[in-house]
């Protein structure tokens, strides 16, 4: 997109600073907080978005754990270290030299340690379960209509390839969206399921990350789908390593 077309802004990330510095005056943008150049034709990585969010007012988010291997973001917001591609660095540390290992969506997957803690690799989150409860409606939504609408949303709004939306389950008032994406399945240019889930989470909270777009207006056959609460569960390709003390 060019500066003339949209006054040099990033359609997919409003937490950016943009300049018409590209070839032919094309708009180029950097994420706030990190100064990393971002591709505005696709979603910005969650790490860069969290980094940008930390340079703005904070709203902690807290999730719950459904089983022994599923991870949730119980630690709230933190100022993450991202690599130049915007991925979370495997090891994260705070300003008091407390360190921990994270998965590809930035959720802690080990006990906290000190600067000697080693995180050999960034473990991929390959399965995400988005658990929603919708507000009461006159009747239940038609399951296949709901399924089609949510798949369309992830395809069109978040640019997630349909093959990564594994299933949509519905038992009124609970909706579950399963996203699956193994390392071997993710090709260059594919949106990451973690990023799609983060954008969706912010959308349903009324905190859209898209530039100048209205908030999320989900409708199933014309009937508004209003989300009351959202829980997101993360499953990694390698199970997390917490001490037994934490699990008791």
């Amino acid at each position: 997109h060019t500066a003339a077309q949209d006054n040099c802004t990033c359609p997919t990330n409003k937490m950016t600073v943009c300049s018409p510095d590209g070839p032919g005056g094309r708009c180029q943008c950097r994420a706030l907080g990190s100064g990393v150049a971002v591709d505005c034709s696709t979603l910005t990585s969650e790490c860069l978005l969290l980094k940008a969010r930390m340079s703005a007012p904070k709203n902690a988010r807290t999730l719950v754990r459904p089983n022994e291997h599923a991870l949730v973001d119980n630690d709230g917001l933190y100022d993450p270290d991202c690599d130049p591609e915007g991925r979370f660095k495997a090891r994260q540390c705070n300003q008091t030299s407390v360190c921990w290992c994270v998965n590809s969506v930035g959720v802690r997957r080990t006990d906290k340690g000190d600067l000697s803690l080693r995180c050999d690799e960034l473990v991929r989150t390959h399965h995400i379960l988005i658990d929603l409860r919708h507000r009461p409606t006159a009747g239940a939504f038609n399951h296949s209509d709901l399924d089609a609408e949510l798949r369309r949303l992830f395809r069109e709004r978040y640019r997630l390839h349909p093959k990564f939306v594994a299933a949509v389950h519905y038992e009124q008032p609970t909706i579950q969206i399963e996203l699956r994406q193994n390392t071997s399945q993710k090709a260059a240019g594919d949106v990451d399921i973690g990023d799609a889930a983060y954008y969706f989470e912010r959308d349903v909270k009324g905190e859209s990350l898209f530039q100048g777009r209205g908030g999320l207006d989900l409708r199933v056959r014309g009937e508004p789908l209003q989300v009351e609460r959202t829980l997101i569960y993360y499953l990694d390709e390698i199970p997390p390593k917490f001490s037994m003390k934490r699990l008791t």
């Epitope: 943009c18 150049a37 130049p84």
Partner: antibody, heavy 119, light 107 residues
């Protein structure tokens, strides 16, 4: 054609404040498409980006970690200029200081100011 | 920070020679690279941006190529006014960083 004209003292004492100004002609410091930088060059460090300021509905600043605790870049819309303050300075801050416009490419530069830090 | 390593540091060449300067980044930076020319006592001058786009007003004998971690600046036929020091700069991530420079001297 954008032109950047630098001004400021060439000699600063250790522990004092280095202050330089970059006057802009042919563009506006509060332009919503421009980014304004300070860079320095010394034999020991080579070319070193120090930081930038820009306006996008509000002012944004970013600084290099190496100078973050000591640097301030301030725009002055009334005079269409921006300034650099580095405090306190040491002899290691001796360098030629440049202002420049751009973010993904620095297409206009000031003439450079040699600043010597010495007592 | 991303480190940029230029080679060679010094280069002796004659007018009319084809000259190639290499810049290697410590991490992938896609095409977020610029090249500058600097003459003694002067500010750097932008030659190439986005790895291969020629800045307006710069002679076409200058060209840039590369992506990821390896980039080259080529001067197809060296002219007397091209004897100077050349710098690469990565613009992928703050802090923006520069290479150590390549001084092109007259043989």
């Amino acid at each position: 054609q954008v032109q950047l004209q630098q001004s400021g003292p060439g000699l600063v004492k250790p522990s004092q404040t280095l202050s330089l100004t970059c006057a802009i002609s042919g563009d506006s410091v509060s332009s919503t498409s421009a980014v304004w930088n300070w860079i320095r060059q010394s034999p020991s460090r080579g070319l070193e980006w120090l930081g930038r300021t820009c306006y996008r509905s509000k002012w944004y600043n970013d600084y290099a970690v190496s100078v973050k605790s000591r640097i301030t870049i301030t725009p002055d819309t009334s005079k269409n200029q921006f300034s650099l303050r580095l405090n306190p300075v040491t002899p290691e801050d001796t360098a030629v200081y440049y202002c420049a416009r751009g973010d993904f490419r620095f297409d206009s530069w000031g003439q450079g100011t040699l600043v010597t830090v010495s007592s | 920070d991303i480190q940029l390593t230029q080679s060679p540091s010094f280069l002796s060449a004659s007018v009319g020679d084809r000259v190639t300067i290499t810049c290697r980044a410590s991490q992938g930076i896609s095409s977020y690279l610029a090249w500058y020319q600097q003459k003694p006592g002067k500010a750097p001058k932008l030659l190439i941006y986005a790895a291969s786009t020629l800045q307006s007003g710069v002679p076409s004998r200058f060209s840039g190529s590369g992506s990821g971690t390896e980039f080259t600046l080529t001067i197809s036929s060296l002219q007397p006014e091209d004897f100077a020091t050349y710098y690469c700069q990565q613009v992928k991530i703050y802090p923006l960083t520069f290479g150590g420079g390549t001084k092109v001297e007259i043989k």
